[in-house]
């Protein structure tokens, strides 16, 4: 190459399809056969073109026709007279991809092709997107400014056309498009949250455009608060509403996880509250939803659980009534007798003594959820409840001997049943049969019987003398026997008996005594008379 001719241009130029680029270029040529007034012509050619016959892609030579495919798109913006060969390529197309070289003509001598020192134009797919600058969270009713920037700007290149679309732009105000950015002002509404706002950048060639979509985040108070429940690590379900407050039944010992989630912007602080006691809370940036774990629910975990979601724009809360179900526990009988208000707790197998004729109230008590069905049985027979509204209460206004025996309270429950039994023993004072006497060969034989509960004791009196055991003189003999509530005693009197003596049989227990007398001893023909006294 002639050392007096040189050109400086980048070796490779890359431009996205449809865009415009400016290629800086400078060159030098000898001052030979031209003056300052001699016109300087510059030409850019595709490397496939013959410079003498072919059309350049750009030139400042008005009478020279340019390549049809580049007409109006390629422009020699530099002044060849000043050694400037800068070229602008607008609306770059795939077919423009090629090697290009520059030719200068000035006067008769300077007619030179810079054949080996051109540039290669590579046209790439348009993948660049505009950048949209928008506050992270928008306040409803507060005007906001959004900027869209497309970072591709060259001198001599026309600015692209910007446009905006989005549901929030029913009444937008846009500032005029400037070189490579657009400013949009609008006032977001609550309903604009989660809607799209798109900045479109359109270039001269039809169909060549770039766009960027952002999702609007408009601040709003918590809404759509949802409580869901996961039990024993099963997937979460929403509780069933019962009235205004959802109701949840859980079995004692179950694993429960209560989950609370709310839609809000900015994210809300979530908290779980049980009867005004905060059980757990989350930071706005913490994990969502907020979980409350009850590893093995207890009866004491029952109650109203409230989830509260709160941010600077407001709050929302929802409650959940938890009922922990469990089978009967601590089943026992409380007893009130003889109108005493003092209640005693009796456990299973207790024996309960009651005085005949007294009143007795048995109250069966247990804890369970839901309440167990209570009933009383005696010797396998179901007893009618004294108070149908409270089948756990059994009232016996006058206890009779026939009431004696086992009473059982049954607590029936879907999760398991229990029963408690107590043994009722009816106490009464002695009832006396006798005494009766008869003569026998050995002497006078008398017998006396008594029934009582507890079993009575019997003793004999002859006049004022108490006859106990056997006399030392063998003058009498007492033979006791007993079976259950009966006590029997036989008295044998030997030897002479003075007439007019009074023989008495006495029966006694803790509840009282009864005695019967024979006022006149019988002759050997039988009994004369008998009198009873208590």
């Amino acid at each position: 190459m002639d050392g007096r001719f040189w050109i400086r241009v980048q070796e490779s130029v890359m431009v996205p399809e449809g865009l415009c680029i400016s290629v800086p270029c400078s060159f030098s040529y000898p001052r030979q056969d031209w003056t300052g007034s001699t016109p300087a012509y510059g030409y850019w050619f595709k490397a496939v073109t013959e410079t003498t016959k072919g059309a350049p892609v750009a030139t400042n030579h008005q009478s020279r026709e340019v390549e049809m495919s580049t007409r109006g798109r390629f422009q020699l913006t530099g002044d060849p007279a000043k050694g400037n060969c800068s070229l602008v390529i607008r609306d770059a197309q795939m077919q423009d991809e090629s090697q290009y070289f520059f030719r200068v003509e000035r006067g008769s001598y300077v007619r030179y092709n810079f054949m080996n020192d051109g540039f290669f134009l590579k046209v790439t797919a348009l993948t660049q997107k505009p950048d949209v600058y928008i506050p992270e969270t928008l306040e409803p009713g507060q005007p906001v400014t959004v900027i869209c920037v497309f970072n591709w700007a060259f001198e001599e290149c026309p600015p692209p056309s910007f446009s905006w679309t989005g549901a929030a732009l029913s009444s937008q105000g846009t500032k005029p498009t400037t070189s490579h950015f657009s400013v949009l002002s609008f006032t977001p509404r609550p309903q604009d949250h989660n809607t799209d706002l798109t900045c479109h950048v359109d270039f001269s060639r039809k169909g060549v455009s770039a766009q960027r979509t952002v999702r609007l985040r408009v601040a709003y108070a918590p809404r759509d608060l949802v409580i869901s429940i996961s039990r024993d690590n099963t997937p979460a379900l929403e509780p069933q509403p019962q009235g205004n407050v959802p109701y949840l039944e859980a079995q004692k010992g179950q694993f429960l996880r209560l989950l609370c989630a709310a839609d809000s912007q900015p994210p809300a602080t979530l908290s779980w509250v049980l009867q005004n006691r905060v059980l757990s809370s989350s930071h706005p940036w913490g994990p969502r939803p907020l979980g409350l774990e009850l590893p093995g629910v207890k009866a004491g975990d029952s109650g109203r659980y409230t989830c509260r979601a709160e941010n600077r724009l407001g709050s929302q809360q929802r409650a959940l009534d938890l009922s922990v179900q469990y089978p009967p526990e601590n089943l026992r009988v409380m007893v009130s007798q003889a109108n005493r208000t003092v209640l005693e707790n009796l456990g299973n197998g207790t024996s309960l003594p009651v005085l005949e004729g007294q009143s007795l109230c048995l109250v069966c008590v247990t804890h369970s959820s839901p309440p167990a069905r209570l009933s009383w049985t005696q010797r396998g027979q179901v007893l009618s409840p004294s108070q149908p509204s409270d089948p756990g209460v059994l009232e016996l206004p006058r206890v009779q001997v026939e009431h004696e025996g086992e009473f059982t309270c049954h607590a029936r429950h879907p999760l398991g049943s229990q029963h408690v039994s107590l043994s009722l023993s009816v106490h009464y004072s002695p009832k006396l049969l006798g005494p009766s006497c008869s003569w026998e060969a050995e002497g006078l034989h008398c017998s006396c019987s008594s029934q009582a509960s507890p079993a009575p004791s019997l003793r004999w009196w002859l006049g004022e003398e108490l006859l106990e055991g056997n006399s030392s003189q063998d003058s009498f003999e007492v033979t006791p026997s007993s079976a259950g509530p009966w006590a029997n005693s036989s008295l044998s009197l030997h030897g002479g008996l003075s007439s007019g003596l009074r023989l008495r049989c006495e029966a006694w227990n803790v509840h009282g005594a009864q005695s019967g007398s024979i006022l006149q001893l019988p002759d050997k023909k039988g009994l004369i008379s008998t009198a009873f006294s208590n």
Partner: antibody, heavy 120, light 107 residues
Framework: QVTLKESGPALVKPTQTLTLTCTFS??????????LSWIRQPPGKALEWLAH???????RYNPSLKSRLTISKDTSKNQVVLTMTNMDPVDTATYYC????????????WGQGTTVTVSS | DIVMTQSPATLSVSPGERATLSCKAS??????VAWYQQKPGQAPRLLIY???NRYTGVPARFSGSGSGTEFTLTISSLQSEDFAVYFC?????????FGGGTKVEIK
């Protein structure tokens, strides 16, 4: 003088991967603006452009085959390699290595072509 | 993809006669069209680029015209060596696509 020569297996089985090599001379693929393409032609049918590689290792693929194609170059060996996975009998064709005139998207230099048959 | 449709599929012409081959693009491709000639057992050969520019060494009897969507290759006076298959190609947008070809045979 610019020459291009394709080489590779004449027969491949379905599902196999085809590897074709284009060995060139008369120019350097490190020169700005230089690039090579692969084009194929099934028997008695039209030509189909497959892929292109530039001097700067930038690549272009036909979208309909992009997932199956890989083009690469070894400038020191003056070679360009095309691999095509999951071959099928419909891929039976003559495969050409071509060069664009001054980097243009029309092709002045063609290799002789290599015929590939896909059959089990 | 841009579809290039060539017609007719076969053209029967006598030597010395004029042959006109048509190529239609499914969308505007400007002048980004090239024409190739292919003889049996050979690789294609570039004839025309940019719709109307004849490639170096191509005889003057071959000429191209058209822009937008309709393009024509004309062989003014057919020589015996011109009987072959001719393909058009667009390079306006990716992917590059070729026509199905027109076979020019001796009448």
């Amino acid at each position: 003088q610019v020459t291009l020569k394709e080489s590779g297996p004449a027969l491949v089985k379905p599902t196999q991967t085809l590897t074709l090599t284009c060995t060139f001379s008369g120019f350097s693929l490190s020169t700005s603006g230089m690039g090579l393409s692969w084009i194929r032609q099934p028997p008695g049918k039209a030509l189909e452009w497959l892929a292109h590689i530039y001097w700067d290792d930038d690549k272009r693929y036909n979208p309909s085959l992009k997932s199956r194609l890989t083009i690469s170059k070894d400038t020191s060996k003056n070679q360009v390699v095309l691999t095509m996975t999951n071959m099928d009998p419909v891929d039976t064709a003559t495969y050409y290595c071509v060069r664009g005139l001054y980097g243009n998207w029309f092709f002045d230099v063609w290799g002789q072509g290599t015929t590939v048959t896909v059959s089990s | 993809d841009i579809v290039m449709t060539q017609s007719p599929a076969t053209l029967s012409v006598s030597p010395g006669e004029r042959a006109t081959l048509s190529c239609k693009a499914s969308q505007n491709v400007g002048t980004a069209v090239a024409w190739y000639q292919q003889k049996p057992g050979q690789a294609p050969r570039l004839l025309i680029y940019s719709a109307s520019n004849r490639y170096t060494g191509v005889p003057a009897r071959f000429s191209g015209s058209g822009s937008g969507t309709e393009f024509t290759l004309t062989i003014s006076s057919l020589q015996s060596e011109d009987f072959a298959v001719y393909f058009c190609q667009q390079y306006s947008s990716y992917p590059l696509t070729f026509g199905g070809g027109t076979k020019v045979e001796i009448k």
